[in-house]
């Protein structure tokens, strides 16, 4: 009688002694901010420690009768969730809770702030294990909030929180949208986005990832032994919080870059029907639900990336979309989209000493997006080689010349407002090793690493008809760094990763007619470190 | 099938120390808590406390709280009720119990130990 | 604490007639995250453990005869045997599951008239 979100983040595979942390989170403590907290639940009693916390506003009305179980049952809930006895997902870590949402669950951005400087300040005094942090609230967008979370999280602090339920993007509410934070949606137990009323569970690139949020069975604060079912993205958090304490737990020395690559990859991929979002967010939604590692050894030799997509440029000429990696990663390769085909490509370049992902919209272009790689690369030494455009019509090449240096993606960028009005080269060179390819009248950027055992190499899946989604993948054992579409396709929207396969989008075949011109190849470049393969195996 | 198998009836004097068991069987012991429940001669049934043997984490009836310690060992599926030093009011039918989040009633119980304490 | 009251404490009809048992709790089993009264009844023979016969109040425990019914909700509850058998002698006990310390009521005794 095992209860379904449970077992759904139990991956197939997994085996009683294959994955068992030490006591399942026992050396990681969760800081929960939430209501108050019915501690002496049988579910969660001595798991839970009631810090003096307290920064909440008056409740609302005149009328208002505060009783006791109404006011903890939001926390109640949430700390059985990620640490309860019977139901929890980490049973072995322990919690603290501070109250920053009143009886009615609500709360201020000063009140959490506070609350955060609270965590940072009992950090610093007594330092312990691996902190998690569970904001399972939202509210609207705040620089200030996200910032303080940013700081928080540079500390070495995992922050998760809710996407929010308001059934929109979550880049508009706050923490959702910080960078920083690892933002979880909520799915059901048929892997569907959760509907909450006329609302939902938000969506949005600013979602990391999805996990069970509706019918969640957990501690009630009605009694000591009583049990209630609760939804919405603050106990699909509380999954992830309590994922993220069990692989703490394994691995102390994650750092929180690692740990939301780890939480990506472990993920259900595509189960969730994109169908429920809107049409514009389907893309930039990550379809992953997630998951426990099958197992805590073996996962540090792989090569590990997600990705990552920039807010929309807006319509405006010379709009351009920025994407970035987090401190710890690096840009493998940078590719860009547009729903109306109209861009001006896309090119990686140094900001602030790292690399980032710009794209450029196009005259009459409804805007673009950048879309960054993001990768795990342990001493990686990574550059940029850019080829201006080529006089010769054999169009424009740059490979990594540099010793020990291997492509891990390709870029290009075009002056000309649409490069779809230029004839394309008669001849079409395949990609390379170590050659990326383009137009001749666009600059082409091949981003190239030097890192240890790193070996990557070139995949193509060409289609002669127009189709409106051309894909090609990595085998098992490699990681997709780049994805781009072959020169001679002028009605390209652009191309982006998902997973481990390289998606390139086109016009609708309709209004391009079937000709030569349709044809469209996707180029993945496939990655692995054999260096981190060999140090996981001597770590055994 | 699921039991709960306590152990032997023992006859103790005043001031000795004792430790009954009770070891669980049939289903997974560390997913369901273990109560102790007296049962004085002709008397009424007294709840003393439960053990969660997955983390062995204890809670008692206040009126037994320093009388008696409940505790387990989940590798070999056995919880504990012990006394460091008997008295002749502990004479008792003991039981063991378990229930859970879902059921949390006593659904198995153990056949019982006495435990006699006379001088 | 929540005390949990029974009445009679002992009671005795004839084989076939029915057997009626209260018990009373201090303050109300019954919460509102589930619908539900944390409130059992279990039968003790002479010499052996309670067996649990009714839990959430009326929900009758698997093998259980069909004559064992139980009602109530909040703070009243009754066991009814429908009609007594001879191997229906026992002391039956009501107990609350809700909070610690758990409290069960003294027992009603049940014998043939």
């Known amino acids: 009688s095992i209860p379904w979100n449970l077992e759904r983040i139990t991956p197939p595979r997994y085996r009683a002694d294959e994955y068992q942390p030490p006591d399942g989170g026992s050396l990681v403590e969760v800081y929960l901010l939430d209501t108050s907290i019915q501690s002496d639940h049988r579910e969660i009693e001595g798991r839970v420690m009631v810090t003096d916390f307290e920064n909440v506003p008056e409740e609302d009305g005149t009328r208002f009768h505060r009783q006791a179980s109404k006011c903890d049952s939001h926390g109640t809930h949430l700390a059985g969730v990620v640490s309860g006895r019977d139901a929890g997902v980490a049973k072995g870590a322990s919690m603290r809770s501070l109250r920053v949402l009143n009886c009615q669950g609500k709360g201020t951005v000063s009140g959490t702030l506070i609350g955060l400087e609270f965590i940072r300040k009992s950090q610093l005094v007594q330092p312990v294990g691996p902190l998690v942090v569970l904001l399972p609230l939202a509210g609207g967008y705040s620089r200030v909030l996200n910032a303080a979370c940013q700081r928080l999280a540079r500390a070495g602090v995992v922050l998760v929180t809710a996407a929010g339920n308001f059934r929109d993007d979550a880049c508009l509410y706050s923490p959702a949208s910080a960078p920083e934070v690892i933002t979880v949606g909520a799915t059901n137990a048929q892997d569907q986005p959760v509907t909450l009323g006329t609302l939902g569970t938000n969506f949005g690139r600013c979602v990391d990832l999805f996990a069970p949020g509706e019918d969640i069975i957990g501690a009630s604060s009605d009694c000591s032994t009583c049990f209630v079912s609760q939804s919405g993205t603050s106990q699909a958090a509380a999954h992830v919080a309590g994922i993220a304490a069990m692989m703490l737990s394994a691995e102390p020395e994650l750092t929180l870059a690692e740990l939301r690559q780890r939480l990506i990859h472990f993920s259900a991929k595509d189960v969730i029907n994109e169908a429920w979002f809107p049409e514009d967010q389907r893309v930039l939604t990550p379809n992953l639900v997630a998951a426990l590692p099958p197992s805590t050894h073996g996962a540090g030799w792989q090569l590990f990336c997600r990705t990552v997509w920039s807010a929309h440029s807006g319509p405006t000429r010379m709009a351009t979309a920025v994407a970035r990696c987090a401190p710890d990663e690096e840009l493998l390769s940078c590719s860009s989209f547009s729903r109306s085909g109209k861009r001006r490509g896309e090119r990686m370049e140094a900001q602030g000493g790292k690399l980032v992902c710009r794209a450029h919209n196009a005259f009459g272009g409804e805007g673009v997006y950048a879309i960054a790689r993001c990768c795990l690369l342990p001493q990686a030494n990574c550059s940029v080689h850019t080829a201006p455009p080529a006089e010769a019509s054999m169009g424009t090449r740059v490979h990594c010349h540099q010793q020990g240096h291997v492509l891990t993606g390709c870029s290009s960028h075009w002056e000309v407002e649409d490069l779809g009005t230029h004839k394309p080269p008669v001849l079409r060179p395949r990609g390379q090793p170590n050659q990326c390819v383009g137009h001749r009248e666009a600059s082409i950027h091949a981003s190239c690493c030097h890192a240890p055992g790193l070996e990557c190499k070139v995949k193509e899946h060409g289609i002669p008809a127009p189709q409106e989604q051309v894909t090609v993948a990595c085998e098992e054992g490699w990681t997709l760094t780049g994805c781009s579409a072959l020169p001679g396709t002028s009605h390209v929207l652009g191309a982006y990763a998902v997973d481990n396969t390289c998606v390139v989008r086109s016009r609708d075949v309709s209004t391009t007619g079937s000709t030569s011109e349709g044809a469209v190849t996707a180029v993945a470049i496939c990655c692995r470190s054999r260096h981190l393969a060999q140090a996981s195996q001597e770590l055994q | 099938q699921v039991q709960l198998v306590q152990s032997g009836a023992e006859v103790k004097k005043p001031g000795e120390s004792l430790k009954i068991s009770c070891k669980g069987s049939?289903?997974?012991?560390?997913?369901?808590?273990i109560s102790w429940v007296r049962q004085m001669p002709g008397k009424g049934l007294e709840w003393m406390g439960w053990?969660?043997?997955?983390?062995?984490?204890?809670h008692y009836n206040p009126n037994f709280q320093g009388q008696v310690t409940i505790s387990a060992d989940k590798s070999i599926s056995t919880a504990y009720l012990q006394w460091s030093s008997l008295k002749a009011s502990d004479t008792a039918m003991y039981y063991c119990a378990r229930d859970r989040w879902s059921t949390p009633y006593f659904d198995v119980w153990g056949q019982g130990t006495l435990v006699t304490v006379s001088s | 604490d929540i005390v949990m009251t029974q009445s009679p404490d002992s009671l005795a009809v004839s084989l076939g007639e029915r057997a009626t048992i209260n018990c009373r709790s201090s303050q109300s089993v019954l919460y509102s995250s589930n619908n539900k009264n944390y409130l059992a009844w279990y039968q003790q023979k002479p010499g052996q453990p309670p067996k649990l016969l009714i839990y959430w109040a009326s929900t009758r425990e698997s093998g259980v005869p069909d004559r064992f019914s139980g009602s109530g909700s909040g703070t009243d509850f009754t066991l009814t045997i429908s009609s007594l058998q001879a191997e229906d002698v026992a002391v039956y006990y009501c107990?609350?599951?809700?909070?610690?310390?758990?409290?069960f009521g003294q027992g009603t005794k049940v014998e043939i008239k």
């Open positions: 107990q609350q599951y809700s909070s610690f310390p758990i409290t």
């Open positions: 049939g289903y997974s012991f560390t997913d369901y808590y």
């Open positions: 053990i969660y043997p997955g983390d062995s984490y204890t």
